[in-house]
Every structure is written in C-alpha cells, then in structure tokens.
C-alpha cells in the first residue's frame, strides 16, 4: 500500500507520457489521476515503466474500478495485464474478440498462464458457446487449447466451429475428448465428397466407432499409419484383415514395423493367421488355422 502524500508543486500529470518514468512510486500515486490513466491506457505500453511503477498504476485502476475494469480499459492494458491476478480478471466482463486478442498478444509465446486461462474462461462463458471466431483465435495462440478442455466443456462447441480446427490443435487430445469432437466433425463435414471429407475428418478419427471405420474402408482413403494408431482400440479390433487392408491402402505395409504397438498388436491377435498371411508382411501371432473362435461377449449378451 503506497502512502497518501500530496503531489509536489508542478508535478501533476497532465497526460501519460515518458516524463513519468522519472517519478518515484509515491509521486506516481500522488500525481497521476486515475481517470486520466484510464482514458490514456493505450500510452502506458509505449513507456518503459518499471515493474514497481506498473504496480502503482494497477493500484490506481483498482481504486477507480473496485467492481472490475470496464472493457475500454481492459482492451488497452497491454503489459499491465501480466500484473493482474485471476481474482482481478474474474471481475471483468470481456465481450469483444478484439479485447481478447489484444490480451493474448501480450502473453504470446508463453505457456497459458492462470491469468490467461481465467480470461478465456470468462470470455467463453460470456458468449455462451465456443463459436468459430473464438476458436480460431484461441487455437492460433494456443494450439493445444481445445485439448485442455474437459469433455463437458467440449460439448458446448457447435459443429460449425469445427471448421476452425487444424490437425495440430488435436495433437494432445485424449480419446474421451475425441469421442465428443468426432460426432460434431462428422456433422460439420457431412456434405463434403469422399476424399475431401477424409482430409477434414482424419484428425478426429480417434473418436470414430467401428461402423464408421468400416464405411471408410470402402472409400479408398489410404489412411496413414499414424492416424490408424490413434484410433480407439475397441473400434479397430472388430475390423477384418480385408477392411484394414482397404482402410490403409499402401500404408498397410507399415503394420510390420508397428506390430508391437497398440492397437496393431491387439488387432493382430484377433485375426486368423491365414488372413494375416495375405498381407504379405510376415506378421505372426494370429489365430492358428483350424481353431474355432468363440465370441464370449456375444454369448453373455444372449444369456
């Protein structure tokens, strides 16, 4: 807390300019009018204030706006944003995408801080859903943003927003998140033709059920091995050798190199050895010829 002291004669700030960098903390407190600061916030960024001086400026704004800053001030906070606590940010009502962009720019190149996370949360909640423009903005600054949301939060993403998602935005998503996103992507891209549809849906396929994979296998898609290995194991296991062969096309040859990794390993164990032999890869570990395969899960369902 800076002591309340009178402003020395002739030092009263008429505008926010470079001369203020020579003011001591107490002089800033005494000589800078909070209302003036609020109207000239855009100038603060251009002036090389010390961290201590910025603390004083923040304190002045806090006194002026105890219920939270107005958006006109928030938009021009610049580096002063880094001084804000999540508690400060929870008092704000940010509705403009331009304000959000301006503040994200300040934190650009750094990990998502608690301040940024709170800001995004306030912004999205204020909008009611994660629309395309917001998603575009957030993933541009934080490619991993989408995968940081819970499946519940992702359920508020409208299918139309899926168009903004790039493959790299889904890199860190787990199967539960893709389970939520995949049906939305399927809906969003439903009017595209075969090859274009596959290009768009490919990144979301970690949430695809078996029947969709079977359908894709009929479309000459040539899925690459990295995509195949991100599929749900339970969705891959029921696929036949012929279906996997059609799904992967020329990339099926890479199964040999990945035979020890899931879901390839588990899938191999479920196939007949003579079917595996048709792949021409020397894959071993399938069900020997002449063995009878009982589907116990089916039996349990019937009893």
């Amino acid at each position: 807390e800076v002591e309340k002291t009178a402003c020395p004669s002739g030092k009263k700030a008429r505008e926010i300019d470079e001369s203020l960098i020579f003011y001591k903390k107490w002089e800033l407190e005494a000589c800078v009018d909070a209302a003036l600061l609020a109207t000239q916030m855009d100038r603060v960024n251009a002036i090389p204030f010390t961290y201590e001086q910025l603390d004083v400026l923040k304190h002045k704004l806090d006194e002026l706006y105890p219920q939270g800053y107005p958006e006109s001030v928030i938009q021009h906070l610049g580096y002063l944003f880094l001084k804000m606590s999540p508690e400060d940010i929870r008092k704000w009502n940010v509705t403009s995408l331009e304000t959000l962009k301006a503040l994200l720019e300040v934190n650009k190149g750094h990990e998502m801080s608690p301040q940024v996370a709170t800001l995004i949360d306030r912004f999205v909640k204020g909008r009611g859903q994660l629309d395309k423009d917001t998603l575009d903005t957030l993933t541009a600054f934080y490619p991993g943003y989408l995968c940081s949301l819970s499946p519940e939060e992702l359920s508020s993403v409208p299918p139309s927003s899926i168009w903004a998602v790039r493959p790299q935005d889904l890199d860190t998503c787990d199967p539960r998140q893709l389970d939520v996103l995949y049906p939305k992507a399927r809906l969003a891209f439903q009017n595209m033709n075969g090859s274009e549809y596959f290009v768009k849906i490919q990144s979301f396929l970690g949430g695809a059920p078996t029947e969709d994979l079977k359908a894709l296998s009929q479309q000459n898609v040539s899925m690459d091995l990295a995509t195949f290995m991100k599929l749900r194991t339970d969705a891959v296991l029921p696929l036949t050798v012929a279906e996997v062969q059609k799904l992967l096309g020329p990339h099926v040859e890479g199964l040999k190199a990945e035979e020890r990794h899931r879901p390839v390993r588990d899938w191999i164990l479920r196939q007949r050895q003579d079917d595996l032999d048709t792949l021409g890869l020397g894959l071993q570990g399938g069900i020997p010829n002449g063995y009878l395969v009982l589907d116990l899960s089916m039996q349990e369902a019937l009893s």
Partner: antibody
Framework: QVQLQQPGTELVTPGASVKLSCKAS????????MHWVKQRPGQGLEWIGN????????FYNEKFKNKATLTVDKSSSTAYMQLSSLTSEDSAVYYC????????WGQGTTLTVSS | DIVMTQSPSSLAVSVGQKVTMSCKSS????????????LAWYQQKPGQSPKLLVY???TKDSGVPDRFIGSGSGTDFTLTINSVQAEDLADYFC?????????FGGGTKLEIK
C-alpha cells in the same frame, strides 16, 4: 543372403513397351512387398509404386499410374514392372527394392529409349 | 505430396573431419503413438544402387559403421558422419515413408578433398 537380381541394360525404341524383371532370393518372397524406384542420370530418386507379392495388390504414385504396371510371379519369386508408350523421358535406371524400409535394392536396370 | 528438402546439395571434406547434412520435410513425419519418425537415409556410391543406412530417423541398419548418426524429429532431420573415411564418398538421400507417394530429398553429394 538377400539378393535382388536385375538385368543390367535394356534398349528399346520410342512408343514400345518393356518388361523389367527383379528376381528375389535369400528370403520369403511373400513376406515383403516389392517397390520400384526411378533414377534419371544426375537426378534424384522417384518412387513408382509397390506390390504385395502375396495377393498381387498394387499401389502407384499418381505420376506413374498410366506408365507402369507391376506384377509378380510367386513360383519364380520374381517381380516385374512393365513400362508402356516409352519416350526419352523414360530413359533412366530402374531399381526394385524390398519392403517398407527399402532395406535391400537390386543393382538397377538401365533403360535407354532411343530410335 | 510431402516435399523433402536436403542441404547442402554438395560438400567437400577431408578424411577424419566431421560432416553434417540436413533434411527437412514439409510436414511432420512423427507417429506420436509409437514415437517413430518415418524417415530413412540412404547412401549411394558412384555406379552402385542405394543402400539403407538409417531408418526411423535414428536407428542404424545392421552393418552400418558407428560413425554414421541419424537424428531429429518431426520435420527436421540430420545425418552426421563422425570422422569421414575415403569410402564415404557418395550421394546421401533422405526419404519419407509416412505417406504415399513416398518421396526422396534431392540428395547431398559428399566429396573427399
């Protein structure tokens, strides 16, 4: 030891077709796919396509789809590539190579298209 | 198609020197599930066919001398030859087998001073 034997040279006239061979030995022929690669003098390498010797499935680089046809004869452990409607642009060394990693290569066949 | 770019296109070094060549791909070659990069390096000596040196970006093929070291991940890869020998005179190609059509870099020609 693994060997992929290819004839050294082929001389053909423009407009004709040629069938290049690659005889494999020293491993189970049906356990590795066979790839074909083109190399023009002083230039880089281009992947033409591959074939599954077990069932004859083929996949081609779009660029060579109307130029190359890949086949195999399991009984002689030999892979073939037929090139059609030959022009001087097809003059190159053609290699067969084993498997996804291309871990063994034939010595290459030098194809010369000239009238 | 994935574009593979190699640099330099040629370099000349003395026997015993260390040499480094680069290969960049236009998209990531990493399979994040298995943590394998689908990139291989080949050596082609004058008048011979290519020979596999390194696969999965850093795994040496059997019989390849220890002086050959592959490294890198994603889109940037390097082949290093520690203490170059006269028999290393050759063209070196990188190749992606992440997706078809499988594509090769333009090559780096290694000459011995």
């Amino acid at each position: 030891q693994v060997q992929l034997q290819q004839p050294g040279t082929e001389l053909v006239t423009p407009g004709a077709s040629v069938k290049l061979s690659c005889k494999a030995s020293g491993y189970s022929f049906t356990s590795y796919w066979m790839h074909w690669v083109k190399q023009r003098p002083g230039q880089g390498l281009e992947w033409i396509g591959n074939i599954n010797p077990s069932n004859g499935d083929t996949f081609y680089n779009e660029k060579f789809k109307n130029k190359a046809t890949l086949t195999v004869d399991k009984s002689s452990s030999t892979a073939y590539m037929q090139l059609s409607s030959l022009t001087s642009e097809d003059s190159a060394v053609y290699y067969c190579a084993r498997g996804w990693l291309r871990d063994y290569w034939g010595q290459g066949t030098t194809l010369t298209v000239s009238s | 198609d994935i574009v593979m770019t190699q640099s330099p296109s040629s370099l000349a070094v003395s026997v015993g020197q260390k040499v480094t060549m680069s290969c960049k791909s236009s998209q990531s070659l990493l399979n994040s599930s298995s943590q394998k990069n689908y990139l291989a390096w080949y050596q082609q000596k004058p008048g011979q066919s290519p020979k596999l040196l390194v696969y999965f970006a850093s795994t040496k093929d059997s019989g390849v001398p220890d002086r050959f070291i592959g490294s890198g991940s994603g889109t940037d890869f390097t082949l290093t030859i520690n203490s170059v020998q006269a028999e290393d005179l050759a063209d070196y190609f990188c190749q992606q087998h992440y997706t078809t059509p499988y594509t090769f870099g333009g090559g780096t020609k290694l000459e011995i001073k």
